[in-house]
Interface confidence: medium
């Protein structure tokens, strides 16, 4: 079901956000905030 796929994808996105915020704020790893074109 498409809604289920969307929800699962969004959940993974939110978890990814949480991990990266943790890395930025707690471990001091500053990410690039945009993708650079090669």
């Amino acid at each position: 079901h498409s809604d289920g796929i969307f929800t699962d994808s969004y959940s993974r996105y939110r978890k990814q956000m949480a991990v990266k915020k943790y890395l930025a704020a707690v471990l001091g790893k500053r990410y690039k905030q945009r993708v650079k074109n090669k």
Epitope: K21, A25, V26, R30, Y31, K32
Partner: antibody
């Protein structure tokens, strides 16, 4: 809350110098960085680098500063070690707190320099 | 590294007037831009962060805008105390794998109040 730089003064070309930034009224926390910025007489601001105030102590430097400049920290101070100094390094050196501002719905925090020290003058001359 | 270019400098206006300062990044910085005010013999003072958010205590006469590579600081109802040099700063993060940074400042714009 305040920051104060010390250790500036006259240094010979090719010499070394270590500047110290002391924090008062607040303690380093895990969502901020301490940074160094310099300003040559009559010129603009030039970012040198930052150190994460959390346990990792990760450092980030401007491309031009890598190799000659080293940032380190203790629980209440941050130091900037400078080597192979030349006249071009003559400047007022500021330390600043680089604070995290978390954005709802974004991958990353954004940062801004919300607290600055008064600066300390470094003169490189023979 | 990202390069920040400010124009014009200097810029002048009458008391009560309006000035606009432009800041252009060499590539998109996703609105991670701050503005600072510096007066002679003093350290810079934070005015605006994240393009448009006013720092506490900064008058609403200061307004930031922009996106992508182009950003603007507008000061309205100019006062004599607004005479200073204004700097933009890209506050994008550094690479996770390297120690090079993008916390680059623009060259500064002097505001003269007549």
């Amino acid at each position: 809350q305040s920051l104060e730089e010390s250790g500036g003064g006259l240094v010979q070309p090719e010499g070394s110098l270590t500047l110290t930034c002391t924090a008062s009224g607040f303690s380093f926390n895990s969502s901020s960085y301490m940074c160094w910025v310099r300003q040559a007489p009559g010129k603009g601001l030039e970012w040198i680098g930052c150190i994460f105030t959390g346990s990792s102590g990760n450092t980030y430097y401007a491309t031009w500063a890598q190799g000659r400049f080293t940032i380190s920290k203790t629980s209440t101070t941050v130091t900037l070690e400078m080597t192979s100094l030349t006249a071009a390094d003559t400047a007022t050196y500021f330390c600043a707190r680089d604070r995290a501002y978390f954005l709802v719905g974004y991958f990353y925090a954004t940062y801004y320099f919300d607290l600055w020290g008064p600066g300390t003058l470094v003169t490189v001359s023979s | 590294d990202v390069v920040m270019t400010q124009t014009p400098s200097p810029v002048s206006a009458q008391v009560g007037g309006t000035v606009t300062i432009n800041c252009q990044a060499s590539e998109s910085i996703d609105s991670d831009l701050s503005w600072y005010q510096q007066k002679p013999g003093q350290p810079p003072k934070l005015l605006i962060y994240r393009t448009f958010t006013l720092e506490s205590g900064v008058p609403s006469r200061f307004k930031g805008s922009g996106s992508g590579t182009d950003y603007t600081l507008t000061i309205s109802d100019l006062e004599c105390a607004d005479a200073a040099i204004y700097y933009c700063q890209c506050t994008d993060g550094s690479s996770i794998s390297g120690s090079y940074g993008w916390d680059a400042f623009g060259g500064g714009t002097e505001v003269v109040v007549k």
